[in-house]
Amino acid sequence: EEELQVIQPEKSVSVAAGESATLNCTATSLIPVGPIQWFRGVGPGRELIYHQKEGHFPRVTPVSDPTKRNNMDFSIRISNITPADAGTYYCVKFRKGSPDVELKSGAGTELSVRAK
């Protein structure tokens, strides 16, 4: 049995330009200790979309549901979507360290942007 699962329930999300997109992610535990970060794309060129403690992400808001008893919610909402936001978004768990070590990624959610 896996000690930690990172679950992105939607494989894809379609949003009209100008609207907001909600990207869902839950983790089964806070342990191992370490942050959850959101990225667009994979590999060394991936783009950091949201980090709770570092950086400035004016269009991104955490929208977790704290009433969820059986898991921890790390969902985000991205406002004012444009076609440039299209891509696959990954919720990634890190283990705290110096530096933090990537531990597990969700399966990814593909965001597509429809014309207004």
Partner: antibody, heavy 118, light 111 residues
Framework: EVQLVESGGGLVKPGGSLRLSCAAS????????MSWVRQTPGKGLEWVAT????????YYPDSVKGRFTLSRDNAKNSLYLQMNSLRAEDTAVYYC???????????WGQGTTVTVSS | DIVLTQSPASLAVSLGERATISCRAS??????????MHWYQQKPGQPPKLLIY???NLESGVPDRFSGSGSRTDFTLTINPLQAEDVATYYC?????????FGGGTKVEIK
């Protein structure tokens, strides 16, 4: 019904060792993060140790790091706290506690008393 | 370490009235919209019991006269109306960052 039953407490001299056990039942033990929390009249509640559901990751506060070792046997639904180099300030009631998400302590055992005295 | 300061240390409230307990954290315990602050009740000779998780969520089986509120550094546990069986010591606890810490407790008595 969830049950956590601690055992292994007792009187030990400073520098001595004790091994506490916690027997779990009534829930899927292997899915839960497990911890020990102790309570003293002077210092109140103090977190002592935590282990991940599969046993890979363990965490301790500085006050016990290097002296206490937490382990688990999921096949036996059991949690163990090996306490070495015990000090007078380790005297407390030790509670076993479960954490489904590694956050809040969902369930607590009744506690076992550890007294460190010469 | 995140220090949790509970106030008052003791509280005497008449039956049927409101009891309010405060817990202040030395730094924010919020992350991703969650407040990692929890409340426990402990009666003499018993272990602590979870009442409220993540600031405001009532644990299953806990009477709804208990409620929690707050975010970032300031949190409140409210018991309204206070009943005789609520006489106990109440503790706040943060799980936002290691080492996890507890408040010093608030003893609630009947006036």
């Amino acid at each position: 019904e969830v049950q956590l039953v601690e055992s292994g407490g007792g009187l030990v001299k400073p520098g001595g060792s004790l091994r506490l056990s916690c027997a779990a039942s009534g829930f899927t033990f292997s899915s839960y993060v497990m911890s020990w929390v102790r309570q003293t009249p002077g210092k109140g509640l103090e977190w002592v140790a935590t282990i991940s559901s599969g046993g890979t990751y363990t965490y301790y506060p500085d006050s016990v790091k290097g002296r206490f070792t937490l382990s688990r046997d999921n096949a036996k639904n059991s949690l163990y706290l090996q306490m070495n180099s015990l000090r007078a300030e380790d005297t407390a009631v030790y509670y076993c506690a479960s954490q489904l998400t590694g956050s809040e302590f969902d369930y607590w055992g009744q506690g076992t008393t550890v007294t460190v005295s010469s | 370490d995140i220090v949790l300061t509970q106030s008052p240390a003791s509280l005497a409230v008449s039956l049927g009235e409101r009891a309010t307990i405060s817990c202040r954290a030395s730094e924010s315990v919020d992350s991703y919209g969650n407040s990692f602050m929890h409340w426990y009740q402990q009666k003499p000779g018993q272990p602590p019991k979870l009442l409220i998780y993540r600031a405001s969520n009532l644990e299953s089986g806990v009477p709804d006269r208990f409620s929690g509120s707050g975010s970032r550094t300031d949190f409140t546990l409210t018991i309204n109306p206070l009943q005789a069986e609520d006489v106990a010591t109440y503790y706040c606890h943060q799980s936002a960052d290691l080492p996890w810490t507890f408040g010093g407790g608030t003893k609630v008595e009947i006036k």
